[in-house]
């Protein structure tokens, strides 16, 4: 069942079939005998009751006022009345753009991120039984799609998919051909969910150590799910049996990003571990960022300004 017309202000394009459905429809069926009336008021005219005799273009059904089609002079306020229930709509009928397959003011805009799922389905549940065929146009050029009852696009979005997509339903009513157009303005944008990964803390860290002791160098970053964080040290990683990369820890942030931490553990610190760079790198599709750690003997601390130390 088609949902009722709850929007109080409605804009439609001249020359298309259109309907208003009141929102107490289920109630109306229960009270079959209740008097139900539709009214229109516009400008000077106060509440004029509508019936099929008032216009050959108007049809009344249980819950619905239909226009075959709606025209510019249908602009105005419409009321449905039943007992103590009243519903009001303000209808604005606008001119059709004769130079295009759609009217700019009647366009629904959608933003789709590149590589994300993108779908357009041409459906019209209210007029479904009357529709002969449906065509889908992109920038007013007809797309050749297999299903001509409900043409559909389902794909991962590419920048080339940007444009105006118009679903045009063709239907017959009382021997006349009508069409209903629904247009979407699709804008394809960059993946907005990605952040530039951030390595936390200073870019250069001098760590005071004692020979023979152990040290844990902690590298933390805020990053995207697919980003990687790793340690680089020496000519060939893993050549020093005293150096161990611990398992990465990841915690999801409330914004859906990741806080990652990776520890480099250096055991039994020797002279060869001093004054060399231990680099922690975060890599993403945007590139890389690196922070460095240098182990310094505690005795040599006095030579370096205090603010560069981490513990």
């Amino acid at each position: 069942a088609e949902s009722c017309t709850s929007r109080p202000h409605i804009t439609v394009v001249e020359g298309e079939p259109f309907y208003l459905k009141h929102c107490s429809c289920s109630l109306a069926h229960e009270i079959e005998t209740t008097t139900k009336s539709w009214y229109k008021s516009s400008g000077s005219q106060e509440h004029v009751e509508l019936n099929p005799r008032s216009s050959s273009r108007i049809a009344l059904h249980d819950c619905v006022l239909e226009f075959w089609p709606v025209e510019l002079n249908d602009t105005g306020s419409y009321f449905f009345q039943m007992k103590n229930y009243t519903q009001k709509w303000k209808l604005n009928v606008i001119r059709r753009n004769k130079h295009s397959c759609f009217t700019e003011r009647q366009v629904t805009s959608k933003i789709v991120e590149v590589k994300k799922f993108f779908q357009i389905t041409c459906e019209n549940s209210y007029y479904q039984t009357l529709v002969n065929s449906t065509s889908l146009y992109k920038n007013c050029k007809k797309l050749l799609l297999e299903n001509n009852k409900n043409p559909t696009i389902k794909k991962n979005a590419e920048f080339e998919d940007q444009g105006y997509y118009s679903c045009v339903h063709f239907l017959h009513h009382n021997g006349k051909l009508f069409n209903i157009t629904k247009t979407f303005n699709i804008t394809i944008v960059e993946d907005r969910s990605n952040i530039v990964p951030v390595l936390l803390g200073p870019k250069l860290n001098h760590v005071a150590v004692e020979l023979g002791k152990n040290v844990r160098l902690n590298c933390s970053a805020l990053l995207n799910e697919e980003d990687v964080i790793y340690w680089m040290f020496g000519e060939e990683n893993g050549s020093d049996p005293n150096i161990h990369e611990e398992k990465e820890m990841r915690i999801m942030t409330p914004e859906g990003k990741w806080h990652a931490s990776k520890v480099l553990r250096i055991e039994n610190i020797g002279e060869s571990n001093l004054n060399v760079l231990y680099n922690c790198t975060v890599a993403s599709t945007g590139g890389t960022d690196t922070k460095s750690f240098i182990l310094v003997r505690k005795a040599d601390m006095a030579d370096i300004p205090g603010h560069v130390f981490t513990r």
């Epitope: 960059e190 599709t285 590139g287 690196t290």
Partner: antibody
Framework: QVQLVQSGAEVKKPGASVKVSCKAS????????ISWVRQAPGQGLEWMGW????????NYAQKLQGRVTMTTDTSTSTAYMELRSLRSDDTAVYYC????????WGRGTLVTVSS | DIVMTQSPDSLAVSLGERATINCKSS????????????LAWYQQKPGQPPNLLIY???TRESGVPDRFSGSGSGTDFTLTISSLQAEDVAVYYC?????????FGQGTKLEIK
């Protein structure tokens, strides 16, 4: 339109330098790193290095270290690759490509090194 | 450096038949923190730049026909073309983007038998 537009073909003498440009359009330039990949005639693809567009960090292939410099100009969304001390075996088509899996490529710039 | 080795170097397959190209990395390109394999496949036709087919080892790039599929994890990967078409004649490359330098396989030339 999303594209990478590269500068035109170059003919250089051994020992000279070449600078190839790659202008990005249709996307946010600093969202993706730019890699440079070269292909010698009839050969496979060789990754030369890449530059991080948001901070200027570079990673170069070991064999080109010292001869190659990659830079960017974010104001014009353009990446540059300069190769110095050219040799005949540097004759190749040089491509710029976007991201870490390369979903967008330039058309390529043929650099011929010949005396 | 991570060395990528493709097999075979060249392959001839009949139209409509299945084509399979393998790629082996000298160390794992699987990242346990996010369960992703940092491997891509490209197609290159003469006189053109390479064209991305597959990334994350098995995700098909949009616009790529569904006859192309990628599989594998860790160090062993496969590109499969389920039903070879004439326009699939090209050289195919795998590439790891797990660690710099981001290395390519040597390429596999695919021809029609």
């Amino acid at each position: 339109q999303v594209q990478l537009v590269q500068s035109g073909a170059e003919v250089k003498k051994p020992g000279a330098s070449v600078k190839v440009s790659c202008k990005a359009s249709g996307y946010n330039f600093i969202s993706y790193g730019i890699s440079w990949v070269r292909q010698a005639p009839g050969q496979g693809l060789e990754w030369m290095g890449w530059i991080t567009t948001y901070n200027g960090n570079t990673n170069y292939a070991q064999k080109l270290q010292g001869r190659v410099t990659m830079t960017t100009d974010t104001s014009t969304s353009t990446a540059y690759m300069e190769l110095r001390s050219l040799r005949s075996d540097d004759t190749a088509v040089y491509y710029c490509a976007r991201g870490w899996y390369f979903d967008l490529w330039g058309r390529g710039t043929l650099v011929t090194v010949s005396s | 450096d991570i060395v990528m080795t493709q097999s075979p170097d060249s392959l001839a397959v009949s139209l409509g038949e299945r084509a399979t190209i393998n790629c082996k990395s000298s160390q794992s390109v699987f990242y346990s923190s996010n369960n992703k394999n940092y491997l891509a496949w490209y197609q290159q036709k003469p006189g053109q730049p390479p064209n991305l087919l597959i990334y994350w080892a098995s995700t098909r790039e949009s616009g790529v026909p569904d006859r192309f599929s990628g599989s594998g994890s860790g160090t062993d990967f496969t590109l499969t073309i389920s039903s070879l078409q004439a326009e699939d004649v090209a050289v195919y490359y795998c590439q790891q983007y797990y660690r710099t330098p981001y290395t390519f396989g040597q390429g596999t030339k695919l021809e029609i038998k």
